[in-house]
Amino acid sequence: GPVPPYTALKELIEELVNITQNQKAPLCNGSMVWSINMTAGVYCAALESLINVSGCSAIEKTQRMLSGFCPHKVSAGQFSSLLVRDTKIEVAQFVKDLLRHLRKLFHQGTF
């Protein structure tokens, strides 16, 4: 599919940075989400995992942004091979891991 543009990925990274920096209380009340395989289909995988968190305004913009990088519709309760369904981590840790990976992609130029 189309390659996510440089500036759009930068916006997504900035939003994740914003979340990690502004975090005071436990992010999303400490909600847990499935880990994802960062090596393939990271955008859809991240959306599939985060879409199951509801009522957390802090990550709503991230969820929306991720949908712009994923070609198919993602719904809550939807599971694919992109999710590592034997490990759950806190949303805060998930966001940090995703941020680290996207920064790596950004600097490598492999958007």
């Epitope: 599919g1 543009p5 759009a8 916006e11 942004m65 712009g68 990088f69 994923c70 519709k73």
Partner: antibody
Framework: EVQLLESGGGLVQPGGSLRLSCAAS????????MSWVRQAPGKGLEWVSA????????YYADSVKGRFTISRDNSKNTLYLQMNSLRAEDTAVYYC????????????????WGQGTTVTVSS | SYELTQPPSVSVSPGQTASITCSGD??????ACWFQQKPGQSPVLVIY???KRPSGIPERFSGSNSGDTATLTISGTQAMDEADYYC?????????FGTGTKVTVLG
């Protein structure tokens, strides 16, 4: 605060041309897709055209294909709609709309709308 | 071309529930959005991703989407909810808006 300000509307004769502009502020313009949506008097909403973010793809409704051209100048934070061969049925309020991010921007939801500019095609 | 069909009008008493449907072929496979438009004003996004509310939109607005039908529900409808409502989806490289529904709050 995200703001969109349309201009360029007016009265034009059938077969004539008009160029609409939309000045954007309050967000990283180049990252976001942008659309034009119109509304004829007393009628519903009709999408006209979209321009993706830095990906550069353009999309058009069948009703305007070949007559209208969407473009953008990221250095000026401005979206344009060049309208040629105008017809009476093109009479409408034209809204500039902020779309989403990424190649599948249409998944995002049209968040921010301008106030609109009125185009009247009449002899 | 893809079409989204809505009832032309829906009437509701204050405090009651209004439901607006939007029908289109396999609409449940796509993300549906809903817009509210009051006379003389620009449209406002009230639901995206089938059921998500943008910040600032009251909780009384909710949405669902499955099969061929998306539904916008306004619970505890207030006089200020009187407006035109449009559904929207993306199909084959074009946005499609529904035909629009005028919601009238009685009394």
């Amino acid at each position: 605060e995200v703001q969109l300000l349309e201009s360029g509307g007016g009265l034009v004769q059938p077969g004539g041309s008009l160029r609409l502009s939309c000045a954007a502020s309050g967000f990283t313009f180049s990252s976001y897709a942008m659309s034009w949506v119109r509304q004829a008097p007393g009628k519903g909403l009709e999408w006209v055209s979209a321009f993706s973010g830095s990906g550069g793809s353009t999309y058009y409704a069948d009703s305007v294909k070949g007559r209208f051209t969407i473009s953008r100048d990221n250095s000026k934070n401005t979206l344009y709609l060049q309208m040629n061969s105008l017809r009476a049925e093109d009479t409408a309020v034209y809204y500039c709309v902020q779309d989403g991010l990424g190649p599948y921007f249409y998944n995002y939801g049209m968040d921010v709308w301008g106030q609109g500019t009125t185009v009247t095609v009449s002899s | 071309s893809y079409e989204l069909t809505q009832p032309p009008s829906v009437s509701v008493s204050p405090g009651q529930t209004a439901s607006i449907t939007c029908s289109g072929d396999k609409l449940g496979d796509k993300y549906a959005c809903w817009f509210q438009q009051k006379p003389g004003q620009s449209p406002v996004l009230v639901i995206y991703h089938d059921s998500k509310r943008p910040s600032g939109i009251p909780e009384r607005f909710s949405g669902s989407n499955s099969g061929d039908t998306a539904t916008l529900t306004i619970s505890g409808t207030q006089a200020m909810d009187e407006a035109d409502y449009y559904c929207q989806a993306w199909d084959s490289s074009t946005y499609v808006f529904g035909t629009g529904t005028k919601v009238t709050v009685l009394g």
